[in-house]
Interface confidence: low
């Protein structure tokens, strides 16, 4: 289905507008910002998402990257250029004219510079690491109910196929959980690592993209799973490259 | 379906001004943009400017600045274009046409029958 | 403004024929041309956008390709319908602008 039929509502996005336009008065729904209309059986691209959502501010987020090619979205929110399929161009430009490389989560892997930088492709980020650290709680969590219940979470709330989450960690109370999805990998019709991260990540802020359910509530044998911190990495196919100044 | 539907023709004096409106039925007006292109008799396409349906601002093309006027109603789902101080090479089909908001999708789905307007004293 | 010139001005082809019409843009408009096919006394209709995506409904004898400045719309095997002028548009910035277009006649 388009979007549900009953109430022409999209239910894995409430930043569109839907009415029944589509054949023979099917449900249809648009996403804000781009008018694209979107496919409400599956999770809506970030970039649609960022676009949709451009003038909501957006903390900036620095810490020790876990590797050294890895990516921290320290840029916030801007407003993509999203390709007829929703996904990230690979150059994005803001209106004073300055453009910069992004990967397919859409962020900055390249120094910025003026019109004339060359984006040649959409570089793929195959690999994504969640940083989560929960609230105190009466003692640990057990690591494989915590797994579980995780895995679940991303295969029936995202839809994301169990094989893209290559491993939960914990150390108490840091949690880290592993997407990893190569090009190769990633059948039509697969939902995005990137996609799943983006609106796991706005889940866990309380700003869920999912119309009329309720809130995150993760719960792992009962006991609530509270986050007071999350931490996204990126790595890329191909390294990012920023000058030397960048790094220091 | 998706339709545009333009007014009828109209004929003008040299220095009057026109309005074409375009009632948009069949989607949701405010998801797409709106965008005004005219034709001269025998001649190619040129864009005028188009109308973000959803924030309401326009953006018109250098060469009709300070005569034109793109504004919309959208209780009735209708995008007008207003053309002031015409002159004989104003004579031309106009037409309305729907598009995205942002230029990965200034391309034209769905257009309107068009309305030609013919300046002659 | 980005200027797009489209050539051949005119083609004279038959039914079966391949044909292939370019659009050069002045400058950088990565894959943002779309291509149109205007009847006589018609609107325009939309058959390519984003340099090679197929609109709903056109037929797949239409494809797109090209990127940068340099872009083709080519027509596999002609059919009676086809005859009609074609235009490519960019779609990269404001001012939009359009090819002067092809006009495409039986031979």
């Known amino acids: 289905h388009t979007a549900a039929q009953d109430n022409c509502t999209c239910p894995t996005n409430k930043m569109t507008v839907c009415s029944p336009d589509g054949p023979g008065g099917r449900c249809q729904c648009r996403a804000l910002g781009s008018g694209m209309a979107v496919d409400c059986s599956t999770l809506t691209s970030k970039c649609l998402l960022l676009k949709a959502r451009m003038s909501a501010p957006k903390n900036a987020r620095t810490l020790v990257r876990p590797s050294e090619h890895a990516l921290v979205d320290n840029d916030g929110l801007y407003d993509p250029d999203c390709d007829p399929e929703g996904r990230f161009k690979a150059r994005q430009c803001n209106q004073t004219s300055v453009c910069w490389c992004v990967n397919s989560v859409g962020v900055r892997r390249t120094d910025k510079g003026d019109l004339s930088l060359r984006c040649d492709e959409l570089v793929r980020t195959h690999h994504i690491l969640i940083d989560l650290r929960h609230r105190p709680t009466a003692g640990a969590f057990n690591h494989s109910d915590l797994d579980a219940e995780l895995r679940r979470l991303f295969r029936e709330r995202y839809r994301l196929h169990p094989k893209f989450v290559a491993a939960v960690h914990y150390e108490q109370p840091t949690i880290q959980i592993e997407l990893r999805q190569n090009t190769s990998q990633k059948a039509a019709g697969d939902v995005d690592i990137g996609d799943a991260a983006y609106y796991f990540e706005r889940d866990i802020k309380g700003e869920s993209l999912f119309q009329g359910r309720g809130g995150l509530d993760l719960r792992v044998r009962g006991e609530p799973l509270q986050v007071e911190r999350t931490l996204i990495y990126y790595l890329d196919e191909i390294p990012p490259k920023f000058s030397m100044k960048r790094l220091t | 379906q998706v339709q545009l539907v333009q007014s009828g023709a109209e004929v003008k004096k040299p220095g009057a001004s026109v309005k074409v409106s375009c009632k948009a039925s069949?989607?949701?007006?405010?998801?797409?943009?709106m965008q005004w292109v005219r034709q001269a008799p025998g001649q190619g396409l040129e864009w005028m400017g188009w109308?973000?349906?959803?924030?309401?601002?326009?953006k018109y093309a250098e060469d009709f600045k300070g005569r034109v006027t793109i504004s919309l109603d959208t209780s009735t789902s209708t995008a007008y274009l207003q053309l002031s101080s015409l002159k004989s090479e104003d004579t031309a089909v106009y037409y309305c046409?729907?598009?995205?908001?942002?230029?990965?999708?200034?391309?034209?789905?769905?257009w309107g029958q068009g309305t030609l307007v013919t300046v002659s004293s | 403004d980005i200027q797009m010139t489209q050539s051949p001005s005119s083609l004279s082809a038959s039914v079966g024929d391949r044909v292939t019409i370019t659009c050069k843009a002045s400058?950088?408009?990565?894959?943002?041309v779309a291509w149109y096919q205007q009847k006589p006394g018609k609107a325009p209709k939309l058959l390519i956008y984003?340099?090679?995506y197929r609109y709903t409904g056109v037929p797949s004898r239409f494809s797109g390709s090209g990127s940068g400045t340099d872009f083709t719309l080519t027509i596999s095997s002609l059919q009676p319908e086809d005859f009609a002028v074609y235009y490519c548009?960019?779609?990269?910035?404001?001012?939009?602008?359009f090819g002067q277009g092809t006009k495409l006649e039986i031979k």
């Open positions: 046409a729907r598009s995205g908001f942002g230029s990965s999708y200034w391309y034209f789905d769905v």
């Open positions: 069949g989607y949701t007006f405010t998801t797409a943009g």
């Open positions: 109308i973000n349906t959803h924030s309401g601002v326009p």
């Open positions: 400058q950088d408009v990565s894959t943002a």
């Open positions: 984003s340099a090679s």
């Open positions: 548009q960019q779609h990269y910035i404001t001012p939009l602008t």
